[in-house]
Amino acid sequence: PEPPTACREKQYLINSQCCSLCQPGQKLVSDCTEFTETECLPCGESEFLDTWNRETHCHQHKYCDPNLGLRVQQKGTSETDTICTCEEGWHCTSEACESCVLHRSCSPGFGVKQIATGVSDTICEPCPVGFFSNVSSAFEKCHPWTSCETKDLVVQQAGTNKTDVVCGPQDRLRA
């Protein structure tokens, strides 16, 4: 028969014949022959291959370097890489999470719209009218101004985006 020019899925063409690819978690040792199938062997400890492949070397699992603020979120297997995340209070600098930076704090006048995670930074938003933040924080949202009316008080000093209103007693002399 004519030698193949293309092979099925999970196969590859070598020496005019179709050989099976190695399954995830295994590496290629020897191509198939007319007598034997492809020879594959398992990846070693701390190695992985995540696709059907003809790689002769497995990839090393990612190292979550604590000196860079990293820790293991999910341990790697022979078929998956280790997933790193950042220590509490830090977040990844990129999608690959190769290093971490401290979560940003929202300055006075700004509140936290979205609290940071291991992979995303704090998102701040300016406090709108009626709200304020008087601290620099990575957790605090903008707080609503105090409602003097509900306390039977009146506004003595208007609030800003950084300060709360100041309430005071009603003027008794007023009819």
Epitope: V29, S30, D31, E39, L41, P42, T56
Partner: antibody, heavy 115, light 110 residues
């Protein structure tokens, strides 16, 4: 069909080194690992190590670590096994074979270590 | 790694079946489905007759079969023929790019 052809018999003095070659023909040289196995007279098979011709990476059996070196020459499709600090107990037939599975074997090379 | 354990000898009459065992550990035979068997006639290089526990290379007769249970692999030669008289070796992948052989079994056809 892969064929492995080894170099000829050697007689060596204790303390010296021997380098055995294994030339591959047929198939793609870089697409299979090569194991080395030895067999002392009247004894069983002993795996010595392997070399991956595509990257030249090696793995040696603990027993031979520090005494064996496996190399390859992709231009001539040849792999080499060098054993140093030879002793009389190293007298054996040395085989190269394809892969860990060892589905094709060389004809063997007799190495005699004698003073 | 220490060698896998095989009986030094086995025998059978023509037409009979004989089984050779190969015992390893949970780090080699028990851990991987990468057990091979070789036949070696005197003065010749070994020949692969079984790989990946139970697969036969093309051209090897189905009189040769093999299996594995736990840390022990077995080779069965059925319908014994005079030419089956030879030494038989098992091998197993042992992890970390290492391989270990059995000590060999001399099969005699009576």
């Amino acid at each position: 069909q892969v064929q492995l052809v080894q170099s000829g018999a050697e007689v060596k003095k204790p303390g010296s080194s021997v380098k055995v070659s294994c030339k591959a023909s047929g198939g793609t040289f870089s697409s299979y690992a090569v194991s080395w196995v030895r067999q002392a007279p009247g004894q069983g098979l002993e795996w010595m190590g392997m070399i991956n011709p595509s990257g030249g990476t090696t793995s040696y059996a603990q027993k031979f670590q520090g005494r064996v070196t496996m190399t390859r020459d992709t231009s001539t499709s040849t792999v080499y096994m060098e054993l140093s600090s030879l002793r009389p107990e190293d007298t054996a037939v040395y085989y190269c074979a394809r892969g860990f599975r060892m589905d094709q074997w060389g004809q063997g090379t007799l190495v005699t270590v004698s003073s | 790694q220490s060698a896998l354990t095989q009986p030094p000898s086995a025998s059978g009459s023509p037409g009979q079946s004989v089984t050779i065992s190969c015992t390893g550990t949970s780090s080699d035979v028990g851990a991987y489905n990468f057990v091979s068997w070789y036949q070696q006639h005197p003065g010749n290089a070994p020949k692969l007759i079984i790989y990946d526990v139970r697969k036969r290379p093309r051209g090897i007769p189905d009189r040769f079969s093999a299996s594995k249970s736990g840390n022990t692999a077995s080779l069965t030669v059925s319908g014994l023929q005079a030419d089956d008289e030879a030494d038989y070796y098992c091998s197993s992948y042992a992890g970390n790019n290492n391989l270990v052989f059995g000590g060999g079994t001399k099969l005699t056809v009576l």
